[in-house]
């Protein structure tokens, strides 16, 4: 009996948003199965997604243990158990992933405007502090808990009646901006980590406009 045509995985790609982290690869298996292993640079390899025919593996549980560590994964290819093959002894084929440091590389998810409140010519806009899957003392941390002052938000706002946008920035989750009395404004926010070299910005939040349910207007 001959050897099997086991092929090594390729195109190993990290897909990560707000620390929810999936490793994807190709090809779809034919007469083979995969096992993923993950390790930090100094740690032991740990098997995940063992003996699977999937081409993705959720590694969130591992990377959230320390999001500032750098991780490496590898995908092993094994001939399926129903394949009658005999060859000389040989290590299984595997392919290494690129290195991945969650704190520096996870994509920032699309933020959401939680509320806005107008008091006279001031508007307070609050950004929802999204929960992540990172845990400390058995509770899930928010994006702000994890990133602290490394995370800022940029607010884009404009009069409903015009297209000229203004911007404001905050290193909290709240903005206090000046507006013209009697005018309705629309808002959109973006999460930013200025210190990053990659994945610095999120996509823009959905637009929210005054005169809709999210806001509150108080004439003083």
């Amino acid at each position: 009996s001959g050897t099997t045509n086991t092929v090594a995985a390729y195109n190993l790609t990290w897909k990560s948003t707000n620390f929810k982290t999936i490793l994807e690869w190709e090809p779809k298996p034919v007469n083979q199965v995969y096992t993923v292993q993950i390790s930090t640079k100094s740690g032991d390899w740990k098997s995940k997604c063992f003996y699977t025919t999937d081409t993705e593996c959720d590694l969130t549980d591992e990377i959230v243990k320390d999001v500032k560590q750098t991780y490496l994964a590898r995908v092993f290819s094994y001939p399926a158990g129903n394949v009658e093959s005999t060859g000389s002894a040989g290590e299984p084929l595997y392919e290494n992933s690129p290195e991945f440091t969650p704190y520096l590389e996870t994509n920032l998810g699309q933020p959401t405007i939680q509320s806005f409140e107008q008091v006279g010519t001031k508007v307070n806009v609050t950004v929802e502090d999204e929960r992540t899957l990172v845990r400390r003392n058995n509770t899930f941390l928010s994006l702000r808990d994890v990133f602290g002052k490394d995370l800022i938000y940029t607010l884009y706002y404009w009069k409903s009646s015009s297209s000229g946008k203004k911007t404001a920035k905050t290193n909290t989750n709240e903005f206090l901006i000046d507006v013209d009395k009697g005018e309705n404004y629309c808002f959109s926010v973006q999460a930013v980590i200025p210190s990053r070299t990659v994945n610095r910005k999120s996509t823009d939040s959905p637009v929210e406009c005054m005169g809709q349910e999210k806001g509150e207007f108080r004439e003083i």
């Epitope: 050897t3 390899w45 740990k46 003996y51 092993f76 005999t86 060859g87 002894a89 290590e91 299984p92």
Partner: nanobody, 114 residues
Framework: QVQLVESGGGLVKPGGSLRLSCTAS????????MGWHRQAPGKGRELVAV???????HYADFVKGRFTISRDNAKNTVYLQMNFLRAEDTAVYYC????????WGQGTMVTVSS
């Protein structure tokens, strides 16, 4: 060529237990998968259980809760503890190790009968 030698098969009554062992003739890397398949009379070979070098396991649905696979990397040995055996577990049980290729033992017969 990796040689795998099984032992522990035999005749057992329904509800009884057996422990199969399989030892490789040479050092098996921890990156190898080791496991067990079985072939009942007149049927094809089917997966029973497999185990990684760091002890992660995968079982066929029909043995979950009854069979336990374990592995001793230092001894190049894999075990299959079989409890609550049923007549339909009667088969030849084959040890296997998978690296770049699959390596199979000669098989050990398990007969469950009253």
């Amino acid at each position: 060529q990796v040689q795998l030698v099984e032992s522990g098969g035999g005749l057992v009554k329904p509800g009884g237990s057996l422990r199969l062992s399989c030892t490789a003739s040479e050092t098996i890397s921890s990156t190898y998968i080791m496991g067990w398949h079985r072939q009942a009379p007149g049927k094809g070979r089917e997966l029973v259980a497999v185990i990684s070098g760091d002890g992660v396991t995968h079982y066929a649905d029909f043995v979950k809760g009854r069979f336990t696979i374990s592995r001793d990397n230092a001894k190049n040995t894999v075990y299959l503890q079989m409890n609550f055996l049923r007549a339909e577990d009667t088969a030849v049980y084959y040890c296997y190790a998978a690296g770049r290729w699959n390596h199979w033992g000669q098989g050990t017969m398990v007969t469950v009968s009253s």
